[in-house]
């Protein structure tokens, strides 16, 4: 797998690998259009989860506000569905016992925002 | 910072840390069989980038298909805007010189999908 050494090399001691300090492109930032979460036809709110033993410590989850979508008149159109857009992301988990600190990758499912779709199933007419 | 040992502890040798093998929730998956990218009023296409020295090796980027949004008649409505939804995610970069393998985290900006918004400025009437 990705994290294993080539077969011709001695195995990794104690089932751990070397992680270099520092993050490439650490200061890279999202530059999304302003307030898209409230201007969207499928608006959403954000919930922030905080964990000091996770990097990044702050993970933001979006939650769609409506079941249907908002039309040009600001009314809900129930012939359309608001659906979440999800993304798998990696975070780093910190584990420490005294001065012995190790890290482990964790896969997290993040809802990034919502989009308005034509329904496949018509639960509601 | 997150990756440094407590001050009372001896410094990390050679500027690297211990990364445990294995990924928590590795089999967690986004339900992608939904075709939301083509059913959305702000549809998008995907481009896949592949890098064998990155984990995950495959990173998928979305590109909005239209400037406007698609109305109920399937026509583009230029009074509304399709905008990308972006997310910062972590990937792991693998660096090797012979049998010496090390890893480093990298921040990557991913466009996950698109949403339809009411414009702030009406460039197009």
């Amino acid at each position: 797998t990705f994290f294993q050494k080539p077969e011709s090399c001695p195995p990794v001691p104690g089932g751990s690998m070397k992680l270099d300090i520092g993050i490439i492109n650490e200061n890279q930032r999202v530059s999304m259009s302003r307030n898209i979460e409230s201007r969207s036809t499928s608006p959403w709110d954000y919930t922030v989860t905080w964990d000091p033993n996770r990097y990044p410590s702050e993970v933001v989850q979006a939650q769609c506000r409506n079941l249907g979508c908002i039309n040009a008149q600001g009314k809900e159109d129930i012939s359309m569905n608001s659906v979440p857009i999800q993304q798998e992301t990696l975070v780093v988990r910190r584990k420490h016992q005294g001065c012995s600190v190790s890290f482990q990758l964790e896969k997290v499912l993040v809802t990034v925002g919502c989009t308005c779709v034509t329904p496949v199933i018509h639960h509601v007419q | 910072t997150f990756f440094q040992k407590p001050e009372s502890c001896p410094p990390v040798p050679g500027g690297s840390m211990k990364l445990d093998i294995g990924i928590i929730n590795e089999n967690q998956r986004v339900s992608m069989s939904r075709n939301i990218e083509s059913r959305s009023t702000s549809p998008w296409d995907y481009t896949v980038t592949w890098d064998p020295n990155r984990y995950p090796s495959e990173v998928v980027q979305a590109q909005c298909r239209n400037l406007g949004c698609i109305n109920a008649q399937g026509k583009e409505d230029i009074s509304m805007n399709s905008v990308p939804i972006q997310q910062e995610t972590l990937v792991v970069r693998r660096k090797h010189q012979g049998c010496s393998v090390s890893f480093q985290l990298e921040k990557v900006l991913v466009t996950v999908g698109c949403t339809c918004v009411t414009p702030v400025i009406h460039h197009v009437q």
């Epitope: 769609c64 079941l67 659906v83 499912l109 496949v120 | 339900s31």
Partner: nanobody
């Protein structure tokens, strides 16, 4: 793993009322909507109602519109189904579930269901 516990089902006369409750635990931070579903004997499970956790926005299947009202308590992570003017055709086992994709969630996407609560409406 989402844990769901439904309660409040009973035997009632046609025209009567019931209030069903559903306690949900283990929901993720991105959980966006909850739904009530029902399964009558010999029939497939069907959608009854849905609610958005954030806005309280509700949607109902045509056959229950005007008679059933879904509500939620975010602090308790509970949803309710107020059922009025009950009809014999409302007889079924009622289930609640997370709707991770809102009204776009398909029945075949559900892995886990609670035990449900039996509603019987006699004529």
């Amino acid at each position: 793993q989402v844990q769901l516990v439904e309660s409040g089902g009973d035997l009632v006369q046609a025209g009567g009322s019931l209030r069903l409750s559903c306690a949900a635990s283990g929901l993720t931070g991105s959980s966006y909507a909850m739904g009530w579903f029902r399964q009558a004997p010999g029939k497939e499970r069907e959608f009854v109602a849905a609610i958005s956790w954030i806005s309280g926005d509700t949607k109902y299947t045509d056959s229950v519109k005007g008679r059933f009202t879904m509500s939620r308590d975010n602090a308790k992570k509970q949803v309710y189904l107020e059922m009025n003017s009950l009809k014999p055709e409302d007889t079924a086992v009622y289930y609640c579930n997370d709707m991770p994709y809102g009204l776009d969630t398909r029945m075949d996407e559900y892995v886990y269901w609670g035990q449900g609560t039996q509603v019987t409406v006699s004529s």
